[in-house]
């Protein structure tokens, strides 16, 4: 049996729409079926409609199909909107130009080439001919409209009504020569449906006999219309899936537009110093992917051919080797001179910040006006004027209230972090937004890092715990355990809450963890007495790039002889250089036979660019960073030592300044190490522990 | 543990709804992915329902899938108008725990449910 | 966004190292990338979270390296059973997720 062709392709759809007739005379046919294209072939055959097809609507809810020998161009007749609804019309009835010699056109062309009037033709005045309507049953020998029943050489004609001329061809043009594009047709809307060779292109929205992933609801801006030829992925001009099995795809012949002007809505926003949106009006001349390898050239085709060139992009200022986005990629790209390398991204240059949907943040994000409202962990934000009170207990001055619209993300606090906002949520009060900080904004959050300020104690008083010995002046040493064995240091700096790092906790399970505090040895051996066990509640980690973790317990620990909370600097503060400070852990030893018990090893504070020195330039710190070097070579902290504390003392008080986090090697002789700065996030870890609900005891 | 249930074999444009079914935790502190693997093919993100049940999607998921959390256990993936494109193995995956704030990743996976979309 | 991970396929002998890259067209938020490794019919298991951080159950022979918009897994001492497809999976603003389209790693 002969597969019957389907014949959708031949209509243009028109979704939630249907036709309403006005005048009563016109006929109408239903029927129930399944699919628009079962409508479709019996439209397209006329079977048994005692009518000429059209148009269609067909009803999804219903499941019904209803045939009409009018259009929405026909008189008597009003388009109307219908959920339910999408309009089928039959493109030859709708379409003013045509397609090879015009043996489809079913327009309404009515005049000669020289202007005449057409003969009707069902008349035999003024001229007699044999072309009646019955006769050429599907040729739509309709009125008097310009007509090619026989596909002849010069396209539509028809009788004149001038006695003196029997027949003469009707202007009509080709559809090539009405449509028309700029550059490479990226926004070309028009209604060419075959390719450059006339096979007739396959519907957007099928996927045969072609599969393809450009689904019209899945790119709703890209005009997938029907089976129109479009440029949805930056072809060099627009082109078609085919409705010949063996053809996939093919370009269409379509010419471009005399002027080439551009609508001003299909120009990108030009821009030369950053991006805006996916970056295709990017101008600049920024020419190296984003490691420093330089852009080939787009007019050459060494070291990788390519079809991307001037000539086929037409509009996408394709010059020298500057980053460009010629083709709707994610951001502006080039091919690379490195023969291994194809293609990068020249993902450097910086986003231009809008003033909605802002990406990045300046500073401390306090003048952030962006309209990002969800947290870090995918929380709504909750509306600023639902959180006053809140907000009034941890700031003591009057919030911008100008700046606290809606639930947008804010900084009212001057959070040293970024933007962040409440959630309603009770386990995760507040949280941080996930916006990061503009790429290359040097502003810095906190000032005069290498000059000693602010002072990091908060008192000046000596502090000695009932003159207890040496062992008691470690009680906020944590040891943290994964599935029953050490795996992390940690500093109580609060009963309920544990300072340690981020690369302690392999699992999110919170039952693998638990705390053990007032222990010496690393398997609580002799500490019996004076051993803690705490189960784990909750794992905040710290603002973006920190490497911190505030461990909430799940009950408070008991200060006594042995466990106690150690204090945190002020915040921003600086500790001068040459300061003595150690650090504690049950780590890797270097000995073979290691006894468990907790080590010291003495450092001391070095300014950020002497320590960049001793790491012979390689590392440039920040301000979230703390150097101290050792006084023994090859001492100081290594694996187990992790989110253990770097301590210090300042006016008889000791602080914890830094916490250890994986760096560049264990102990490496004249390399010191590199802490996680504590005071840098000493707002945050204070806000955490006034905001964070705990257990109490 | 987590496990996906609803996958068959659909004909092009009837909708169908995945359920991912979880024990051992709590829907109200963890967030949820939807993430599929067409054969042979690699794995793409769909969406998600978060912590608080609001909803994410990629790009090309709006408006073809929609993901509700419907209990404290159960999260769904409704595939409105299924085209054969979506033939796949469907994943549920947590992505965020309110019990570890700040560490967005998938650890905890269902084995998944094979969707077949065929005429 | 869009993760674009290289090569799509490598191959090394038993104790070999295998270095696999990931590409991001925009930034990835606090550097929440991870590595996943799948098995044929099996779920993906994480090795790294948070660009660097060790899984659970993951040797140290898996690291993870990189910030910002490039990435890196890196494979030492190469075991047969190492054999498997690895995906990268970035977090960005407005909380989307994205999967690089994965690297097959063949064992010889």
């Known amino acids: 049996q002969r597969k019957r062709r389907n014949t959708i392709h031949e209509f243009k759809k028109s979704a939630k729409t249907t036709l309403i007739k006005i005048d009563p005379a016109l006929k109408i046919k239903t029927k129930k079926v399944n699919t628009a294209d079962q409508c479709a072939n019996r439209c397209t055959r006329n079977k048994g409609l005692p009518f000429t097809c059209k148009a269609f609507v067909f009803d999804k809810a219903r499941k019904q199909c209803l045939w009409f020998p009018f259009n929405s161009m026909s008189s008597g007749v009003k388009k109307e909107f219908g959920h339910e609804f999408d309009l089928y019309e039959n493109k030859d009835y709708i379409r003013n130009c045509i397609i090879g010699k015009g043996r489809s056109y079913k327009g309404t062309v009515s005049i000669t080439k020289s202007g005449i009037k057409c003969q009707p033709w069902s008349s035999m005045i003024p001229h007699e001919h044999s072309f009646l309507p019955s006769s050429y049953r599907g040729k739509d020998l309709q009125e008097n409209y310009c007509r090619n029943p026989r596909g002849e050489e010069g396209g539509p004609w028809c009788f004149t009504s001038n006695p003196e001329v029997r027949y003469e061809v009707c202007d009509i043009p080709q559809c090539s020569e009405v449509e028309c594009m700029t550059c490479n047709g990226e926004s070309y809307r028009g209604l060419m449906d075959h390719t450059e060779s006339g096979k007739i292109c396959q519907r957007w929205d099928h996927q045969t006999p072609h599969r393809h992933k450009f689904l019209p609801e899945r790119y709703p801006d890209k005009g997938f219309d029907d089976n129109y030829c479009r440029n949805p992925d930056g072809q060099p001009r627009p082109w078609c899936y085919t409705l010949d099995p063996h053809t996939r795809w093919e370009y269409c012949a379509i010419k471009t537009c005399a002027d080439n002007t551009m609508n001003d809505t299909d120009v990108p926003l030009e821009t030369t110093e950053c991006i805006q949106g996916q970056g295709e009006g990017y101008r600049g001349t920024v020419n190296t992917i984003w490691n420093g390898i330089p852009c080939q050239r787009w007019d050459s085709q060494y070291p990788h051919e390519h079809d991307m060139t001037p000539e086929n992009f037409k509009c996408k200022d394709l010059r020298e080797n500057y980053c460009r986005n010629p083709d709707g990629s994610e951001s502006p790209w080039c091919f690379t001179t490195d023969p291994n390398i194809r293609v990068g991204y020249c993902s450097q240059i910086p986003n231009c910040d809008m003033s909605h949907g802002q990406d990045c943040y300046r500073g401390n994000g306090k003048n952030y006006m962006g309209n990002l409202s969800q947290t870090r962990s995918g929380l709504t934000c909750s509306m600023w004027d639902k959180n006053m009170e809140d907000l009034h207990r941890h700031i003591f001055w009057e919030p911008d209230a100008s700046k606290l619209n809606e639930n947008y993300c804010r900084n009212p606090d001057d959070d040293a972090h970024g933007p962040w906002c409440y959630t309603g949520n009770p386990l995760i009060p507040w949280d941080y937004c996930p916006i990061s900080r503009c790429e290359g904004d040097t502003t810095p959050t906190i000032v005069n890092l290498d000059h000693p300020v602010i002072s990091c104690a908060k008192t000046k008083q000596l502090r000695v715990v009932n003159g207890i010995p040496t062992r008691t002046n470690i009680g906020w040493m944590v040891s943290l355990r994964y599935r029953n064995k050490h795996i992390c240091g940690g500093s109580l700096i609060k009963e309920s809450w544990v300072l340690t790092a981020r690369q302690c906790f392999p699992s999110r399970d919170l039952k693998d963890y638990e705390a053990w505090l007032g222990i010496h040895d690393v398997h609580g051996r002799g500490d019996e007495k004076c051993k803690q066990v705490l189960n784990v509640s909750q794992l905040v980690y710290g603002p973006e790039g920190s490497d911190l973790v505030l461990m909430k317990l799940a009950r408070p620990a008991v200060l006594d002889d042995f466990v106690s909370t150690i204090d945190l600097p002020n915040y921003g503060c600086t500790i001068p250089e040459k300061t003595s400070c150690s650090v504690y852990g049950w780590g890797y030893t270097g000995l073979i036979n290691y006894d468990g018990l907790l080590r010291v090893a003495h450092l001391y504070i070095m300014g950020n660019e002497k320590c960049s020195q001793h790491h012979r330039g390689k590392v440039t710190l920040n301000e979230s960073e703390i150097c101290a070097g050792a006084e023994k070579i090859g001492s100081g902290p290594c694996e187990g030592d992790y989110g253990g504390p770097l301590v210090c003392e300042q006016h008889k008080m000791r602080m914890v300044l830094g916490v250890i986090v994986p760096g560049r090697g264990c102990a490496i002789p004249n390399r010191p190490g590199i802490f996680v700065r504590v005071a840098y996030y000493a707002k945050w870890i204070h806000k955490i522990i006034l905001t964070y609900k705990v257990p109490q005891s | 543990s987590v496990e996906e249930s609803g996958g068959r074999l659909v004909t092009p444009g009837t909708p169908l709804t995945l359920t991912c079914t979880v024990s051992?935790?709590?829907?109200?502190?963890?967030?949820m992915s939807w993430v599929r693997q067409a054969p042979g093919e690699g794995l793409e993100w769909i969406g998600a329902?978060?912590?608080?049940?609001?909803t994410y999607y990629t790009n090309w998921a709006k408006g073809r899938f929609t993901i509700s959390k419907t209990s404290s256990t159960t999260v769904d993936l409704k595939i409105t108008s299924p085209t054969t494109e979506d033939t796949a193995t469907y994943f549920c995956t947590r992505g965020e725990y309110a019990g570890v704030v700040g560490s967005n990743y998938f650890d905890l996976w269902g084995q998944g449910t094979l969707v077949t979309v065929s005429s | 966004q869009v993760l674009t991970q290289t090569p799509p396929s490598v191959s090394a002998v038993v104790g070999g190292t295998v270095t696999i890259n990931c590409q991001s067209s925009q930034r990835i938020y606090s550097n929440w990338l991870s590595w996943y490794q799948q098995k044929p019919g099996q779920t993906p298991k994480p090795l790294i979270y948070?660009?660097?951080s060790l899984a659970s159950g993951v040797p140290s022979r898996f690291k993870g390296s990189g910030s910002g918009t490039q990435f890196t897994l890196t494979i030492s001492d190469l075991e047969c059973d190492d054999a498997a497809s690895y995906y990268c999976a970035g977090y960005y603003s407005g909380h989307i997720y994205s999967f690089g389209g994965g690297t097959e790693v063949v064992v010889k």
């Open positions: 051992g935790i709590d829907l109200n502190s963890n967030g």
């Open positions: 329902s978060s912590i608080d049940g609001t």
């Open positions: 948070a660009a660097s």
